[in-house]
């Protein structure tokens, strides 16, 4: 029967008792920076070419037995699981290996450096086809290293990297807290997240997604036919790599930007017992799992967003937070959310000729995140248009005014501490979707875009009595931009986007009387783009 | 159901040539590799070499490397061991078989075509 | 290349009694990694193909009757019929498949007595 994490990774609609996915990766090399390999097991022999390339440390300790099949042990395994021909995912994929960690699985910073400059300068000599470089290998934090793995990215590979094993915060650890690369934590059949002795994967907001890594049958280097389960989040990763792979052949001209949000939107949705996970880190931590596409082509038409968070800003006083969107991506929407209900609101503001989403902390709160809303949305003219405290009794109003210019988001920053304690909440006049209102001490941000064929509309949802979270979603076809708390609502913690739900969260309902005060709103800005529909239907 | 339909038996001459098939079917042929074994009238089992479809990887055992040829075309489902010049030492049965990593040579195998060269 | 050697070539047991086959291979089929022993066992009655009995030396292959059984590892291996049937009469082979190229024992002929 076919192995549980090649049936997990495909789309119901191809399930079967076997796994046979539409394309398999034929058009993608896959370079696998790792251990040294048994390149002539059943599994691999003719699909990874072992490169000459070689830069590791001496084995510790003197009585280290250099034998063969475990010094091949972790890069076997892994070449299998990315393009095997029994075990494998993208069963068409060829590889190049780089044998970067020693035969007791240690690298060097330095010798991963030079093994990316290597596949620089073969990609610079020789341009093929797309590229993924697999990198399951974690080290502490390195900022030289992520600057590498920027660098490569920006040459247009697609880096995919493992998590950690850690059972800690994968912002930690280098390459996964690099942003531009494709960072994969560990789940197993159950699709909880993986225990491994007393660590297990890593978790936070530098994941990407998470996909299966417990118990994954591969190439065994103990001989050129054996077989051996092995976890971690390189096996998760592996899968990653090669879904790419296959994602990337179907469609040779994706760009990463464009690669990562499809990954992120086919993946399945909230299967993770988030409890595994930190009680800090559950909010930060993405509830996904990698899946193939259940097609191949045909993806184009819809708007991709995804959420960004920031790093946490830290207490001090004016301490904020800054949540950025890759190269290709617009920012659409910017909120914030702070644990302790302190702080000073969000906005979106440019740096270095880019949009990014700044939120504040308040004087005596714990710490702020900001939260972005990247999406793809090609041609996009996109700028903020804000308005000062208005002091006026109806509060503070903005609109897209440009034509052709539509409301993708609604960001709400104030100076003073405490705003709306003890103030009526701000009503929105119906009849006025295009428009963000706030108190009247607040300034208010609008992000408005121009795009061919993009349609917005607001939705929301209003609960009376106080509670601990409301959440209003998008419906099928729309693709949430804009996630906000209607203001009137002080004991809003914050609000931020989860797939297609615009969630706001509130503090504990025992602490909060049940006057109008208790009201809670979600608001949602739904888009769609009837051009890229088009586009799409045209070429099919 | 998951099967392999081999061609019929075949009777040549020493030099001639030949080329026996094995159809797969209830599966998809290009994701387990094919498994072909010979058996001479009376004797054991001998594993020849194998083909995995989807992409032509070959693997030989070397007693049988450059006596025959094993290929497969994936648009049909099919397999095949060819000889370019047959010998009266080739007269046996000849198996092929599905074969998949969880299992050896697997619980399913082709019915066996019988090849008799003799002048 | 691995060479299998089974013992006895033939064995003749009554219905109902217990019919043991050996097999040892020339280096050991046993991989630390998963602890598993790359070793199969095989019926073949004539004009039949083989059928695959035990497969990691003694994981019985579903539909299989539970009487056959196997057991050993690293070099040696036994499969045991615990109480033969008329059906039964048959071949049966080891195999191993830890290295190419793949190799069978040369055979064990089991009659009724």
């Known amino acids: 029967s076919i192995p549980w994490n090649l049936e997990r990774i495909t789309p119901p609609r191809y399930r079967a008792d076997e796994y046979q996915p539409p394309d398999g990766g034929s058009l993608v090399e896959v370079y696998l920076l790792d251990t040294s390999i048994q390149s002539d097991h059943r599994e691999i022999e003719g699909r990874v070419m072992v490169t000459d390339f070689e830069n590791v440390p001496e084995e510790d300790g003197t009585r280290f037995h250099r034998q063969a099949s475990k010094c091949d042990s972790h890069g076997t395994h892994l070449a299998g699981v990315v393009s095997g021909r029994d075990a494998g995912v993208a069963k068409g994929a060829s590889m190049r290996s780089l044998r970067v960690l020693n035969c007791q699985g240690k690298g060097t910073v330095s010798g991963t450096l030079i093994g990316l400059e290597f596949i620089r300068k073969s990609q610079l000599v020789q341009p093929v086809g797309p590229l993924v470089v697999l990198l399951p290998l974690a080290g502490g934090y390195s900022r030289v290293l992520n600057a590498a793995c920027q660098r490569l990215a920006r040459a247009g590979v697609v880096l995919v990297t493992a998590a950690g094993n850690f059972r800690d915060d994968a912002c930690l650890y280098s390459p996964a807290s690099a942003p531009e690369v494709i960072t994969v934590g560990a789940t197993n059949a159950q699709d909880q997240p993986v225990t491994l002795g007393t660590l297990g994967t890593n978790f936070g907001r530098c994941v990407d997604l998470f996909a299966p890594g417990e118990d994954i049958i591969g190439a065994s280097s103990d001989c050129s036919t054996c077989f051996v389960s092995q976890s971690g989040t390189s096996q998760a990763a592996a899968h990653v790599a090669g879904i790419a792979a296959m994602m990337l052949s179907a469609e040779p001209e994706l760009t990463l930007a464009e690669l990562r949000q499809r990954l992120i939107h086919f993946s399945a949705k909230d299967v993770i017992n988030e409890a595994w996970f930190p009680e800090d880190q559950r909010v930060l931590t993405p509830n996904l799992v990698a899946a193939l596409p259940p097609s191949t082509h045909g993806a184009g038409w819809q708007l991709f967003c995804r959420t960004v968070w920031s790093a946490h800003s830290g207490p001090t006083r004016m301490a904020t937070a800054v949540a950025r969107c890759a190269p290709d991506e617009e920012l659409l929407s910017c909120s914030s959310f702070s644990r302790s209900g302190k702080r000073r609101g969000e906005r979106m503001e440019a740096q270095g000729g880019k949009l990014v989403c700044r939120a504040h902390n308040a004087f005596g709160g714990e710490g702020v995140y900001a939260i972005a809303r990247c999406c793809l949305l090609p041609q996009a003219n996109c700028s903020v248009h804000t308005a000062p405290p208005a002091e006026a009794s109806m509060g503070t109003r903005v609109h897209c005014h440009q034509q052709g210019h539509v409301l993708t988001g609604c960001s709400s920053h104030w100076e003073v501490e405490d705003l709306g304690t003890h103030k009526p909440p701000v009503l929105r006049p119906r009849g006025q979707p295009n428009q963000c209102v706030g108190h009247r001490e607040a300034s208010i941000h609008a992000s408005c875009c121009h795009a061919p064929g993009l349609e917005c509309k607001v939705k929301e949802h209003g609960i009376p009595a106080p509670q601990e979270q409301v959440t209003v979603a998008c419906e099928e076809g729309w693709t949430l931009t804009g996630c906000s708390a209607l203001p009137g609502t002080s004991h809003v913690l914050g609000a931020y986007a989860v797939d297609n739900t615009c969630v706001v969260r509130s503090r504990d309902v025992s602490t909060t009387g049940s006057t109008s005060e208790g009201a809670v709103t979600a608001v949602a800005i739904c888009c769609r783009s009837r051009h890229l529909a088009q586009a799409s239907q045209e070429l099919q | 159901q998951v099967q392999l339909v081999q061609s019929g038996a075949e009777v040549k001459k020493p030099g001639e040539s030949l080329k026996i098939s094995c159809k797969g079917s209830g599966y998809s042929f290009t994701n387990y590799y094919i498994s072909w074994v010979r058996q001479m009238p009376g004797k054991g089992l001998e594993w020849m070499g194998l083909?995995?479809?989807?992409?032509?990887?070959?693997r030989y055992n070397r007693k049988f490397q450059g006596q025959v040829t094993i290929s497969a075309d994936k648009s049909i489902s099919t397999a095949y061991l060819q000889w370019s010049s047959l010998k009266a030492s080739d007269t046996a049965m000849y198996y092929c078989a599905r074969d998949y990593y969880s299992r050896p040579l697997s619980d399913v195998w082709g019915q066996g075509t019988l090849v008799t060269v003799s002048s | 290349d691995i060479v299998m050697t089974q013992s006895p070539d033939s064995l003749a047991v009554s219905l109902g009694e217990r019919a043991t086959i050996n097999c040892r291979s020339s280096q050991s089929v046993l991989y630390s990694s998963n602890n598993k022993n790359y070793l199969a066992w095989y019926q073949q009655k004539p004009g039949q193909p083989p059928k695959l009995l035990i497969y990691w030396a003694s994981t019985r292959e579903s539909g299989v009757p539970d009487r056959f059984s196997g057991s050993g590892s690293g070099t040696d291996f036994t499969l045991t019929i615990s109480s033969l049937q008329a059906e039964d009469v048959a071949v049966y082979y080891c195999?191993?498949?830890?290295?190419?190229?793949?190799?069978f024992g040369q055979g064990t002929k089991v009659e009724i007595k």
């Open positions: 083909i995995y479809p989807g992409d032509s990887y070959t």
């Open positions: 195999q191993q498949y830890s290295s190419f190229p793949i190799t």
